[in-house]
């Protein structure tokens, strides 16, 4: 006996009460795969989530975080609190960069500059709590016989910079 | 650290009003949902309804006919009113926060025993 | 409205030994689900919250998986301290809904 489940498109289920008819899926579900016996109940987005996009009978609706916040987790199953560029998420709450790191994000943890020595070169602009160190040529490029058609900045280590 | 501490008439009489209040100590009251949920030995935990600090609710659908959750923001405290109570309303009630990352509940009151009997 | 069931009701396991507590949903939930621990005469703590995320200063030895409609608490050494009921908690959809709990003894 062939099943005739397997005919029902996305957006419908399989009613057997009725005789294996495809039964469009009732308000507030869906049903994103054809040959559904059942239709999942729609997500809602609240408390801490808002609606990205609105459930329709194909495909479940989909949640952000409200503002503040940010979104983490497989579909946004969570969300985390934004922190200011140059600071980092703490148990207790943002805490700025230490120094010496930098995050240039609204979220993740504060990374270290980068150390331009390891690749021969010297800092060409030092690193605050919000941007990394940008390097520059190595120290020997800079000698005098080097050839340079604009002199470079001069250049500081890190440890200088303001904070 | 945040804490809740509640408080409210323990023992009811058949069709009287329950009436709890939960008290909200440290932390950031206004930007936060604040949960009821109640907990019987034949039901388990059963989640009552919420409020935020504007006042919005989400109510159980099957409380929501005798149910009313008020907020007093100016006291950082939160209300629970449950009418015409029967035995089956018999339980611990808990007050407790929605945390900042997700719909779940990371700070919880002590527990009132509410006991409903003639 | 959404139906979480915890079976077995009580779990038996020796101190050292890992302790496996399936939680089912009636239908699929992404990963909006949390776990509670309840001991004797206290509040449910939250333990785990987006199926698998530890909240603060819950030990290591607490784990989560799964996603959609079956989930799993792991507690991977189990110490005396870990005797209590455990729920699961869905998030997906309003009414928020509590699995029925599993308890966990000394064998």
């Known amino acids: 006996l062939q099943d005739l489940c397997s005919n029902c498109p996305a957006g419908t289920f399989c009613d057997n009460n009725r005789s294996q008819i495809c039964s469009p899926c009732p308000p507030n579900s869906f049903s994103s795969a054809g040959g559904q016996r059942t239709c999942d109940i729609c997500r809602q987005c609240k408390g801490v989530f808002k609606t990205r996009k609105e459930c329709s009978s194909t495909s479940n609706a989909e949640c952000d975080c409200i503002s503040g916040y940010h979104c983490l987790g497989a579909e946004c199953s969570m969300c985390e609190q934004d922190c200011k560029q140059g600071q980092e998420l703490t148990k207790k709450g943002c805490k700025d960069c230490c120094f010496g790191t930098f995050n240039d994000q609204k979220r993740g943890i504060c990374r270290p500059w980068t150390n331009c020595s390891l690749d021969g070169k010297s800092v060409l602009v030092n690193g605050t709590k919000e941007r990394d160190v940008v390097c520059g040529p190595s120290p020997a490029d800079l000698s005098p016989g080097a050839s340079s058609a604009t002199p470079p900045a001069p250049a500081r280590e890190p440890g200088h910079s303001p904070q | 650290q945040v804490q809740l501490q509640q408080w409210g008439a323990g023992l009811l009489k058949p069709s009287e009003t329950l009436s709890l209040t939960c008290g909200v100590y440290?932390?950031?009251?206004?930007?936060?949902?604040w949960s009821w949920i109640r907990q019987s030995p034949g039901k388990g935990l059963e989640w009552i309804g919420e409020?935020?600090?504007?006042?919005?609710?989400e109510y159980n659908p099957s409380l929501k006919s005798r149910l009313t959750i008020s907020i007093d923001t100016s006291k950082n405290q939160f209300s629970l009113k449950l009418t015409s109570v029967t035995a089956a309303d018999t339980a611990v009630y808990y007050c407790?926060?929605?945390?900042?990352?997700?719909?779940?509940?990371?700070?919880w009151g002590q527990g009132v025993l509410v006991t409903v009997s003639s | 409205k959404i139906v979480m069931t915890q079976s077995p009701a009580t779990l038996s396991v020796s101190p050292g030994e890992r302790a496996t507590l399936p939680c089912r949903v009636s239908?699929?939930?992404?990963?909006?689900l949390a776990w509670y621990q309840q001991k004797p005469g206290q509040a449910p703590r939250l333990l785990i919250y987006?199926?698998?995320t530890r909240a603060t200063g819950v030990p290591a030895r607490f784990s989560g998986s799964g996603s959609g409609s079956e989930f799993t608490l792991t507690i991977s050494s189990l110490q005396s301290e870990d005797l209590a009921l455990y729920y699961c908690?869905?998030?997906?959809?309003?009414?928020?809904?509590f699995g029925g709990g599993t308890k966990v003894e000394i064998k």
């Open positions: 987006g199926a698998s």
């Open positions: 239908q699929g939930i992404g990963s909006n």
């Open positions: 409020i935020n600090h504007s006042g919005n609710t």
């Open positions: 407790a926060r929605m945390g900042y990352h997700s719909p779940s509940f990371d700070f």
């Open positions: 440290g932390g950031s009251f206004s930007t936060n949902y």
């Open positions: 908690q869905q998030y997906n959809n309003w009414p928020l809904t």
